[in-house]
Interface confidence: low
């Protein structure tokens, strides 16, 4: 108990000093990421820019719990995720054997006091194809790149076009058509396309971090999670080494 | 104003049980997270056991796992701890609490009873 509150306690030396009384603090996430099928992947969120102790987090995807993490019963995962789902490191969350139905939105939800309830949003998406890992740590070199060879392919489909313009008129039609294909797989796959029609992604429910700030009798009842969980004698939370 | 009233408590030996109840004023249950707490001598007051407003989901602290058992009459507005096979450690106040939101963490609860004495003599 006190090396939890000394945790706590620590947390809150590394925030920086603001006025009381507000809900100064604000949420960094890994954002939108990818994985690849049967992978893993860290799900990660850090609360900066308050003074607030961090009493709890809980791990959620959609509408459904998947980890909590108290400051003093310490880590408590989801029976249903408990092969896959693997606490920390530090207030994070691993994922693991990733499928296609694990895609969606996740949120990390901290409770403070006194600031109260901070929810973070993640977007997983998990892919079929090997592109993923590359996409989760190169999604800015790879579209740069990914639009850098669009324009020259554009660029050099445009000469040829102004050089044979009126001699090959249906050959150019079928190099614009397999442009056309080549440019829309390569968007399919990008770690930052939206989700294509009929894929995993679960919208019908409304998201849980909302439950914080509404307190509705729907999601009062939602977070009464205490069936569904499994305690795990993994110590107290890290409070204070999360690398968000 | 939300009152919670615990009785049931005694002296025991160890290996025998207890059944604690905790009476609330007006209909509170079907709003109200219900939660057991102890506290021992010179110890922090800790968490034994909830039961959610439905009644359905309940949840225990490692320690009484297996032992005790928490359990809600709607109709009589009362919320049982069934403990079984009583430990001398087990030895503590309990307090009976209800929360309208938060989690299972002492700080959550809203209302709090008087508490009842709990001794288990070796």
């Known amino acids: 108990m006190r090396w939890c509150l000394l945790l706590i306690w620590a947390q809150g030396l590394r925030q920086a000093p603001l006025a009381s009384g507000m809900m100064t603090g604000t949420i960094e996430t890994t954002g939108n990421i990818s994985a690849e099928k049967g992978g893993s992947i860290i799900l990660q969120c850090h609360l900066s820019s308050t003074t607030a102790q961090v009493t709890q987090v809980n791990w959620e995807q959609q509408d459904q719990l998947l980890a909590i993490c108290n400051a003093d019963l310490g880590w408590h995962i989801s029976p249903s995720f408990k092969d896959r789902v693997a606490p920390g490191p530090g207030l994070g969350l691993t994922l693991q054997s990733l499928t296609v139905n694990d895609t969606g939105e996740y949120f990390c939800i901290y409770h403070t006091y006194p600031d109260g309830t901070y929810t973070g949003r993640i977007f997983l998406e998990v892919l079929e194809s090997s592109v993923a890992e590359h996409g989760a740590r190169f999604q800015i070199p790879l579209l740069g790149a990914m639009a850098a060879t669009l324009v020259v392919i554009c660029t050099a489909v445009i000469v040829v076009v102004a050089l044979t313009r009126k001699k090959k008129a249906l050959r150019i039609h079928s190099v614009e058509g397999d442009l056309r294909r080549k440019s829309a797989g390569q968007e399919e796959w990008s770690p930052s396309a939206p989700s294509p029609p009929g894929s995993c992604v679960q919208a019908e429910a409304a998201p849980a971090g909302l439950c914080g700030e509404q307190r509705g009798e729907d999601c009062a009842e939602l977070h009464d999670y205490f069936n569904v969980l499994s305690y795990r004698s993994l110590g107290n939370c890290s409070f204070f080494t999360e690398t968000g | 104003e939300v009152q919670l009233v615990e009785s049931g408590g005694g002296l025991v030996q160890a290996g025998g049980s207890l059944r604690l109840s905790c009476a609330a004023s007006g209909s509170i249950l079907s709003s109200y997270t219900m939660g057991w707490f102890r506290q021992a001598p010179g110890k922090e007051r800790e968490f034994v056991s909830t039961i959610s407003r439905s009644s359905t989901r309940t949840y225990y602290a490692d320690s009484v796992k297996g032992r005790f058992t928490i359990s809600a009459d709607n109709a009589k507005n009362t919320v049982y701890l069934q403990m079984n096979s009583l430990k001398p450690e087990d030895t503590a106040v309990y307090y009976c609490?209800?929360?309208?939101?938060?989690?299972?963490?002492?700080?959550?609860?809203?209302?709090w009873g008087q508490g009842t004495q709990v001794t288990v003599s070796s």
């Open positions: 609490a209800a929360r309208l939101w938060g989690t299972w963490t002492a700080g959550d609860y809203d209302y």
